[in-house]
Amino acid sequence: LIQERRSHEVNPAAHLTGANSSLTGSGGPLLWETQLGLAFLRGLSYHDGALVVTKAGYYYIYSKVQLGGVGCPLGLASTITHGLYKRTPRYPEELELLVSQQSPCGRATSSSRVWWDSSFLGGVVHLEAGEEVVVRVLDERLVRLRDGTRSYFGAFMV
Amino acid sequence: LIQERRSHEVNPAAHLTGANSSLTGSGGPLLWETQLGLAFLRGLSYHDGALVVTKAGYYYIYSKVQLGGVGCPLGLASTITHGLYKRTPRYPEELELLVSQQSPCGRATSSSRVWWDSSFLGGVVHLEAGEEVVVRVLDERLVRLRDGTRSYFGAFMV
Amino acid sequence: LIQERRSHEVNPAAHLTGANSSLTGSGGPLLWETQLGLAFLRGLSYHDGALVVTKAGYYYIYSKVQLGGVGCPLGLASTITHGLYKRTPRYPEELELLVSQQSPCGRATSSSRVWWDSSFLGGVVHLEAGEEVVVRVLDERLVRLRDGTRSYFGAFMV
């Protein structure tokens, strides 16, 4: 797994931003803006919510999601799970990479209280060419999108 | 915007730390220590709270602020906003880069309860030479400084 | 302190993951998995909970811990402290590098309520060869381990 940063190569990096279309409600991963505003791809590609690796190596991957609500939606579990997951041809199921669990609704002491919370994840993982990384949030009903600055997803080779 | 990391060049990086003078109360961005203790600048400069880019490229920028209080200050909005913002001559207004909203006071179930919370932001953005990045916290009355380890601001080229 | 990233060298990086043995209850730092699953060491070494630097330079160091509980353990202080600390032969005591304080129990409005919270730290520090970085959590009784994805510790040279 030895991997070097060669001086003549552009270092892979990406930053994808939240958009109106990010929340599908289908149970799939979050979708992301890849070109407009602050979003970019450099030496990585994108497919249906996934950052796709084109060059094997160690990557610092990160995601932030902005959560918010008024009280807690009926039937919402007390736990929100925000995670980064890997898809690889080597294995049939998604693999958890970095995960956080939070109980943000618990901050609201009354059912009509507005609350906000944020979840940040970041860490170094090894990724092979062709492997994909996606972001999932359960329950995504509490993700608050606005302008791409509050919920995002990115990576760079280290 | 293609940018390479050349082997003979020092990679720009900085870590600035919170100090007693960080909170101005003037409505401006937070100010930072640049030399003492853990703080340093390498290939980036500093001016009035801003990290100033000297070499164009993609940078991972980050900030953490330590929040705390006893109950909630009278008249304090239920939302605390912590953000990283860009200033560029290309546009007349500051541009939001990475932002978090939190409702930390909501954790305190009584008005006399001590509470602590922390907000972390990090992400990759493209910055041109001469552009500035600043940190803002609204309401900064809840930022708790101590020794430079709890609130900080940094960047490095990726 | 000028340090360059040379193209023919492997860039030091590591990601260590939480394991059943991470929480010692002895008051020492958290211990980590270094080889299995997502964990790896590349150009850094490990000793009794510490990442040990073999090559001097600036490193982005990070840690996340997953916190959780049912109400608040009797006698638990209202503050949880999660920090990254440096050990150096130059100084007899550990030095705080990056620290967060949180009051996660305050989210639970009743003593029987389940709550979850997460604390993330990351920042750039200068480390000399032979220096060590450890993670501490006070009170570690609230750290929730599972599979290495929720609590972790890592670093890479920038």
């Epitope: - | 961005p29 801003a50 560029t88 001559p89 007349p92 207004e93 030479a129 001469g130 552009e131 | -």
Partner: antibody, heavy 119, light 109 residues
Framework: EVQLVESGGGLVKPGGSLRLSCAAS????????MSWVRQAPGKGLEWVGR??????????DYAAPVKGRFTISRDDSKNTLFLQMNSLKTEDTAVYYC??????????WGQGTLVTVSS | EIVLTQSPGTLSLSPGERATLSCRAS???????LAWYQQKPGQAPRLLIY???SRATGIPDRFSGSGSGTDFTLTISRLEPEDFAVYYC??????????FGQGTKLEIK
């Protein structure tokens, strides 16, 4: 599109006063750092003063030759910047430009308005 | 007070040639806060370069800036007829807060 349009210039006697206006469009003036820059006939550019954005406190700074005589202000409701010039001197004769002043450079300029101080 | 001195005062060149304009500071200035402007007769100045080397929006890539410390350069790689104008350098950060050079006139030979 960002646009700045100055007005209010004209002929004034030494010791007199004049108020210049700069109407901004395409952005919110209160969110911007703004400056006035002047240029005497056939001469180079000279910075006059600046006002910071509202979020940065809206504080003002002035060049030494005009300090105490000139005042920069803003009317946020009209998205307009002002330069109040008192105790005018013949050496204040110039074209006055309204400019944005983010990150140490003047990114956007108005077309300028001529102020002539003469008896 | 930092003084910016531009040279030459006048530069006579033909279209297609390369122009090199110099700006020297009386003491070291931050390269992050060194800008260049172009001004044509009867018009307002236009920002060309900021941060010593970053091109402003819409500026053709034949314009480039370089330098650090006390010596800065604006280069126009291949002169077009519309490039003949007066060029000013400007610094920010030292008292007075913003300072301009006296200008270099680029004229057609």
């Amino acid at each position: 599109e960002v646009q700045l349009v100055e007005s209010g210039g004209g002929l004034v006697k030494p010791g007199g006063s004049l108020r210049l206006s700069c109407a901004a469009s395409g952005f919110t003036l209160s969110n911007a750092w703004m400056s006035w820059v002047r240029q005497a006939p056939g001469k180079g550019l000279e910075w006059v003063g600046r006002i910071k954005s509202k979020i940065d406190g809206g504080t003002t700074d002035y060049a030494a030759p005009v300090k105490g005589r000139f005042t920069i202000s803003r009317d946020d409701s009209k998205n307009t910047l002002f330069l109040q010039m008192n105790s005018l001197k013949t050496e204040d004769t110039a074209v006055y430009y309204c400019t944005t002043a983010m990150a140490g450079a003047f990114g956007f300029w108005g077309q300028g308005t001529l102020v002539t101080v003469s008896s | 007070e930092i003084v910016l001195t531009q040279s030459p005062g006048t530069l006579s060149l033909s279209p297609g040639e390369r122009a090199t304009l110099s700006c020297r500071a009386s003491q070291s200035v931050s390269s992050s806060y060194l800008a260049w402007y172009q001004q044509k007769p009867g018009q307002a100045p236009r920002l060309l370069i900021y941060g010593a080397s970053s091109r402003a929006t819409g500026i053709p890539d034949r314009f480039s800036g370089s330098g650090s410390g006390t010596d800065f350069t604006l280069t126009i790689s291949r002169l077009e007829p519309e490039d003949f104008a007066v060029y000013y350098c400007q610094q920010y950060g030292s008292s007075p807060m913003y300072t301009f050079g006296q200008g270099t006139k680029l004229e057609i030979k």
